[in-house]
């Protein structure tokens, strides 16, 4: 004969568990019905009734099988540093991300409670660790013979170009200025001259070498002076 | 459902310590409170201590307050049992069962239980 099929509340065999979507109601001392996500228990088991479930009011959520007497409050709305990653319904909390260019300072249960900006390396400083989801943008001092002249939270430090004759070498913040040494052209008086760098760049991934090219016919000398070498900025 | 897995349990001094660990999977473990049971062979199964849904507030059974210590690691989805000075009479095996939202320890029913760990306090 086939095993009886027992229904909810019924009392479990002594050692044994209930069974999936049932729990063990420790009043009653039977297995109980929980109620399925986007509900609640309006009624808790006894042992000759089973639990009875009613809908989460808006606002409120149950993601679980369950049988909380209330449904839980749906988290505040996102604040104007976040994005709504997932709405409030019935089943789900809302869950509030950090907008780009801001990471999660305080994490909570899903989602971020406090978002902060990526911090931004000055000019003589890159970034040594890109900024995550949950971390800090690293700045870190240019080493000699590299620089960086933004103020950002993804440039690193770039090499200085490679001159055959250097015009105004370069510094931290700066990148080095050449000038050239064959006469291909006549020019007007006091032009500098900026060949093309051995190396090309990238704003954000370490640069690969290219052969020397053709010197250029002009360029131009950065404006003013160069900034203080300060690590970030909260700007 | 979240699935349970218990481990950490031997054979022990008395005097010693223990500590157990309560893995969950299927999933997060935050959402829940969680208990640990022991049961010692030929008795009912008792609830040693809790540890509530937001981690706010913990429970232990007279016979262990003092010398055991609840505690959850909720990135690495785990529940742990630290025991001191342990005595014969903690001889059982210790069980980890859950409650979703579970707001007040004890717990108010019981939802998955792992296959326990036995624990063995003997000279």
């Known amino acids: 004969l086939p095993a009886q099929v027992a229904f909810t509340p019924y009392a479990p065999e002594p050692g044994s568990t209930c069974r999936l979507r049932e729990y063990y109601d420790q009043t009653a001392q039977m297995c109980c019905s929980k109620c399925s996500p986007g509900q609640h228990a309006k009624v808790f088991c006894t042992k000759t009734s089973d639990t009875v479930c009613d809908s989460c009011e808006d606002s409120t959520y149950t993601q679980l099988w369950n049988w909380v007497p209330e449904c839980l409050s749906c988290g505040s709305r996102c604040s104007s540093d976040q994005v709504e990653t997932q709405a409030c319904t019935r089943e789900q909390n809302r869950i509030c991300t950090c907008r780009p260019g801001w990471y999660c300072a305080l994490s909570k249960q899903e989602g971020c409670r406090l978002c902060a900006p990526l911090r931004k390396c000055r000019p003589g400083f890159g970034v040594a660790r890109p900024g995550t989801e949950t971390s800090d943008v690293v700045c870190k001092p240019c080493a000699p013979g590299t620089f960086s002249n933004t103020t950002s939270s993804t440039d690193i430090c770039r090499p200085h170009q490679i001159c055959n004759v250097v015009a105004i070498p370069g510094n931290a913040s700066m990148d080095a200025v050449c000038t050239s040494t064959s006469p291909t052209r006549s020019m007007a008086p006091g032009a500098v001259h900026l060949p093309q760098p051995v190396s090309t760049r990238s704003q954000h991934t370490q640069p690969t070498p290219e052969p020397s090219t053709a010197p250029s016919t002009s360029f131009l000398l950065p404006m003013g002076p160069s900034p203080p070498a300060e690590g970030s900025t909260g700007d | 459902e979240v699935q349970l897995v218990e481990s950490g349990g031997g054979l022990v001094q008395p005097g010693g310590s223990l500590r157990l660990s309560c893995a969950a999977s299927?999933?997060?473990?935050?959402?829940?409170?969680v208990a640990w049971f022991r049961q010692a062979p030929g008795k009912e199964r008792e609830e040693v201590s809790c540890?509530?849904?937001?981690?706010?507030?913990?429970n232990y059974a007279e016979s262990v307050k003092g010398r055991f210590t609840i505690s959850r690691d909720n990135s690495k989805n785990t529940l742990y049992l630290q025991m001191n000075s342990l005595r014969a009479e903690d001889t059982a095996v210790y069980y980890c069962?859950?409650?979703?939202?579970?707001?007040?320890?004890?717990?108010?029913?019981?939802?998955?239980w792992g296959q326990g760990t036995l624990v063995t306090v003997s000279s």
């Open positions: 299927g999933s997060r473990l935050d959402y829940y409170a």
């Open positions: 540890i509530t849904y937001s981690g706010g507030s913990t």
């Open positions: 069962t859950t409650e979703p939202y579970g707001s007040s320890c004890p717990l108010s029913g019981y939802d998955t």
